[in-house]
Structure formats: structure tokens, C-alpha cells
């Protein structure tokens, strides 16, 4: 008789999840000399230990502490790029501007990027059928708690000028319910961070509006100002040209507004 299995609303664990995590860890530690000391088998064991045999709606930040410890990494605190709802462009940017880092450019972010995972209470099985959805099922699920934990730590580490890339095509350019709005903004440390600089990325080629005047951007400034962190905002009217100019800053067309 097949054992009854909890049906969650979200997609199940990504296929070949253990192999993917292990392979990504090996690849990352090969490319990044400062992380060569990391034992990827131990990393996988710690990752697995955070959610296996645990109820997938009962995960805590504490569960991820062994993994956090193994994945401890120092990135230049003044070279941090946060993003919200515009991951691809943020990653394209840091691939060109190699001295800046998104969370997914760190080991732990790289391991988990675009993956889903969950286990089952009291069994050592990984659930490949379904996992809890943040909205429909529960917020304390393995994936959400992981990203909340690493995002908090990433924001806490930031200093000087912190940049954030925001999607100007969305109805809420700054969304307080996003990871940036609910976790990262509140964990920037005012004694270390002088300025948060927002880059609002425009979608349409003919869009010449000043999206820095958007009400949600003013809301972001309002939150940041109470924490005594300065705020600045720039429109990126042409993201394609923006990336091109990061690659080739000497290009004559790069002196005009992008």
C-alpha cells in the first residue's frame, strides 16, 4: 500500500537536486581560489541536514546555520549589488563588472539559484512531487527560509555605497513584499552603509519618464531615511546600452545619458 504523501501547491524538488548542488559547489570552488578550501561533500551534507526529515513548513534559520558556517565567504562589502525582480540583468552586469557581486555570485547563492527543494517529516526522502508554496501553503518552507537567511546575511555585510537594481516595468518598482523590500532593506547596517543607490531599469525604448519619482521609490526613500542611510536614484533608460557601456566605457556614445 503506497504511503500517503502530502500534496503541496508548489513544484517539487528540482530533478537531480543533490547532484546539481554538488556539481555547482565543485565548479564554484574551482573557479574561485579563495573558496578552494571548501569541502563540497560537507556542504551538501549540511544543506541536506537543513531540510531532510523535517516538516517542510517548519524550517527555521537555525536549520541552515551549519550550511551558513561552511559557506562563509568574504566579498568586498562596498561592491554589493542587490536586485529585485530583475535578476537576469543584474547577473549580466556582474558578469561584465567583475568586481561587483550579487548574492548569486557567492557560493551559497550560486548553489541554490533557480532550484527548489523540500523533504518530508520523519523520512529521509526528498520530495520530488511537490513543495510548499510561499503564499498558498506556508512561508517557513525550505526554499524561502534559505533565501531569507542568506539575503539577510548578505545585506548585513554591505558597507559604503550599496546598489540595487529595480525593475521599472513593474507596477510596483519597489515592492515591500519582495526579498529586497522585506529582508535586505531592513538589514542594511546604518553604521556601515552610507548610501543606497537605486538603479531603475526602464523597459520600453521610448520610455523617458523619470521613474525615480515613482511613489514606490519615494516609499523606499522614506524607509531608508528613517534608518539615516542616504538615498539616491538613477534612471537606466537603455539597459542594453548600459551593459554595452560597462563593457566598453571608452565608447564615445557612453558619455550621454543611458
Amino acid at each position: 500500500v503506497p504511503r500517503w504523501r502530502q500534496q503541496w501547491s508548489g513544484p517539487g524538488t528540482t530533478k537531480r537536486f543533490p547532484e546539481t548542488v554538488l556539481a555547482r559547489c565543485v565548479k564554484y570552488t574551482e573557479i574561485h581560489p579563495e573558496m578552494r578550501h571548501v569541502d563540497c561533500q560537507s556542504v551538501w551534507d549540511a544543506f541536506k541536514g537543513a531540510f531532510i526529515s523535517k516538516h517542510p513548513c517548519n524550517i527555521t534559520e537555525e536549520d541552515y546555520q551549519p550550511l551558513m558556517k561552511l559557506g562563509t565567504q568574504t566579498v568586498p562589502c562596498n561592491k554589493i549589488l542587490l536586485w529585485s525582480r530583475i535578476k537576469d540583468l543584474a547577473h549580466q552586469f556582474t558578469q561584465v563588472q567583475r568586481d561587483m557581486f550579487t548574492l548569486e555570485d557567492t557560493l551559497l547563492g550560486y548553489l541554490a539559484d533557480d532550484l527548489t527543494w523540500c523533504g518530508e517529516f520523519n523520512t529521509s526522502k526528498i520530495n520530488y512531487q511537490s513543495c510548499p508554496d510561499w503564499r498558498k501553503d506556508c512561508s517557513n518552507n525550505p526554499v524561502s527560509v534559505f533565501w531569507k537567511t542568506v539575503s539577510r546575511r548578505f545585506a548585513e555585510a554591505a558597507c559604503d555605497v550599496v546598489h540595487v537594481m529595480l525593475n521599472g516595468s513593474r507596477s510596483k518598482i519597489f515592492d515591500k513584499n519582495s526579498t529586497f523590500g522585506s529582508v535586505e532593506v531592513h538589514n542594511l547596517q546604518p553604521e556601515k552603509v552610507q548610501t543606497l543607490e537605486a538603479w531603475v531599469i526602464h523597459g520600453g525604448r521610448e520610455d523617458s519618464r523619470d521613474l525615480c519619482q515613482d511613489p514606490t521609490i519615494k516609499e523606499l526613500e522614506s524607509i531608508i531615511s528613517k534608518r539615516n542611510i542616504q538615498f539616491s536614484c538613477k534612471n537606466i533608460y537603455r539597459p542594453d546600452k548600459f551593459l554595452q557601456c560597462v563593457k566598453n566605457p571608452e565608447d564615445s556614445s557612453c558619455t550621454s545619458e543611458i
Epitope: Q189, P215, T216, E219, S222, S225, K226, R227, N228, F231
Partner: antibody
Framework: EVQLLESGGGLVHPGGSLRLSCAAS????????MNWVRQAPGKGLEWVSS????????YYADSVKGRFTISRDNSKNTLYLQMNNLRAEDTAVYYC???????????WGQGTTVTVSS | QSVLTQPPSASGTPGQRVTISCSGS????????VNWYQQLPGTAPKLLIS???QRPSGVPDRFSASKSGTSASLAISGLQSEDEADYYC???????????FGGGTKLTVL
């Protein structure tokens, strides 16, 4: 001239309801987070509630959570405070105040008095 | 019980310098915006010091403020009779997601 003008206060029995209004003029209301602060007779200032620029987010003091609702109508330049299930300890002068980034609660109204008594 | 702690009263003679203290914690005074408000008898509070130490326009330079760690203080030099009022410190509190006030200090000019 930047001005906030509260209205809607009065005498109400315990368990009753009141709706306070705050009319703004002289500044772009829709650019500011707005707040209600109260002061019980002979006591200090107590923050009650705030509402974000867009109105999407609201915050409340524990003492009023579940009983008071803050809202705003940017087209009418008006802030509201719906107060239900009022208690004697809600008796106070209620002020509205705007939050100006990097300044604080910048401009205050003259206040409206709410008395909850049987 | 107020989140921020102020002395309930302070006094001084005309021309004197008076200081009012305000004590809080990491989640409010240390890392966030601190303001001081003056409330003259029978009137609404008025912003006296913004952004920890700045005086809004129209506030005399006799009023100054400082902040160190989890404490803030307001200094009034050259005390005048019209300075007789209640003074409140306030700060944004991260952990409460709220504005928090001190209990207020009643300043008497003798």
C-alpha cells in the same frame, strides 16, 4: 502655507466608533507618509499609526491594533483614522503629522479631541 | 512606560544653559533618525531638531542637539522665558516598526 487640519473628534461611549479626518494643504500630500499621534490628558505623545505614500502599507501601535484603521485618499488630500471599539484609555487629543524624509514628523495639525466616557 | 527615557523635569534661570537627555537602544537611537519636539502649553508639538542634529529653518541657534551611541541630548543655551515648554525626543524603532517617543521633559524657566 503647509497645513494639516484634523476633524471628527467628539464624545463617544465605550465600545463606540469615530472617524477622524485630516485635510492637508500647501504641500504634495501624495509624496508623504502620514501618521497619527495622540496625547492623553496630562500625558506624553504616543504614536498611533502610519500609512505609506501609496497607502499599501499600514502600521499600528499594539494598543490600537485590530481596532483602528488608517487610510488615505490622495485625490482628496485627506488622511483618515477609523476608530472602533473605543475604550476610556483612547481619550486623547489626536494629531496628524507628515513624515518628511531625513527630517521626522515635520508638520503637525492642531489636533482633535476624542473623549471616551460613559 | 515610554521606549525612550527622558528626565520628567528640568529647570534653569534666564541666560543659563540647560541639557535634556534621552536614552534608548540600538534599534532606535543608535542607528536611526532622532528628532526633538517642543510643545508650548496648549499647542501642537513643533519639530525642533531633525535628523539627529539639524535645526529646521526658523529654529534659533540657541537650540542644539547631539547623539552618541544609544543616547541623545538637547541643549538650550541662553535660556529665555518663552522656552518654557515640554520637550520630547523621538526616534524610528526598527524592531517595533514604529515611532517611539520619550515621556517628555517639562522645562521650567525660573
Amino acid at each position: 502655507e503647509v497645513q494639516l487640519l484634523e476633524s471628527g473628534g467628539g464624545l463617544v461611549h465605550p465600545g463606540g466608533s469615530l472617524r477622524l479626518s485630516c485635510a492637508a494643504s500647501g504641500f504634495t500630500f501624495s509624496d508623504y507618509e502620514m501618521n497619527w499621534v495622540r496625547q492623553a490628558p496630562g500625558k506624553g505623545l504616543e504614536w498611533v499609526s502610519s500609512i505609506s505614500i501609496t497607502g499599501d502599507f499600514t502600521y499600528y501601535a499594539d494598543s490600537v491594533k485590530g481596532r483602528f484603521t488608517i487610510s488615505r485618499d490622495n485625490s482628496k488630500n485627506t488622511l483618515y483614522l477609523q476608530m472602533n471599539n473605543l475604550r476610556a484609555e483612547d481619550t486623547a487629543v489626536y494629531y496628524c503629522a507628515n513624515y518628511k524624509s531625513y527630517y521626522g514628523l515635520d508638520v503637525w495639525g492642531q489636533g482633535t479631541t476624542v473623549t471616551v466616557s460613559s | 512606560q515610554s521606549v525612550l527615557t527622558q528626565p520628567p523635569s528640568a529647570s534653569g534661570t534666564p541666560g543659563q544653559r540647560v541639557t535634556i537627555s534621552c536614552s534608548g537602544s540600538n534599534s532606535n537611537i543608535r542607528y536611526n533618525l532622532v528628532n526633538w519636539y517642543q510643545q508650548l502649553p496648549g499647542t501642537a508639538p513643533k519639530l525642533l531638531i531633525s535628523n539627529n542634529v539639524q535645526r529646521p529653518s526658523g529654529v534659533p541657534d540657541r537650540f542644539s542637539a547631539s547623539k552618541s551611541g544609544t543616547s541623545a541630548s538637547l541643549a538650550i543655551s541662553g535660556l529665555q522665558s518663552e522656552d518654557e515648554a515640554d520637550y520630547y525626543c523621538a526616534a524610528w524603532d526598527d524592531s517595533l516598526n514604529a515611532w517611539v517617543f520619550g515621556g517628555g521633559t517639562k522645562l521650567t524657566v525660573l
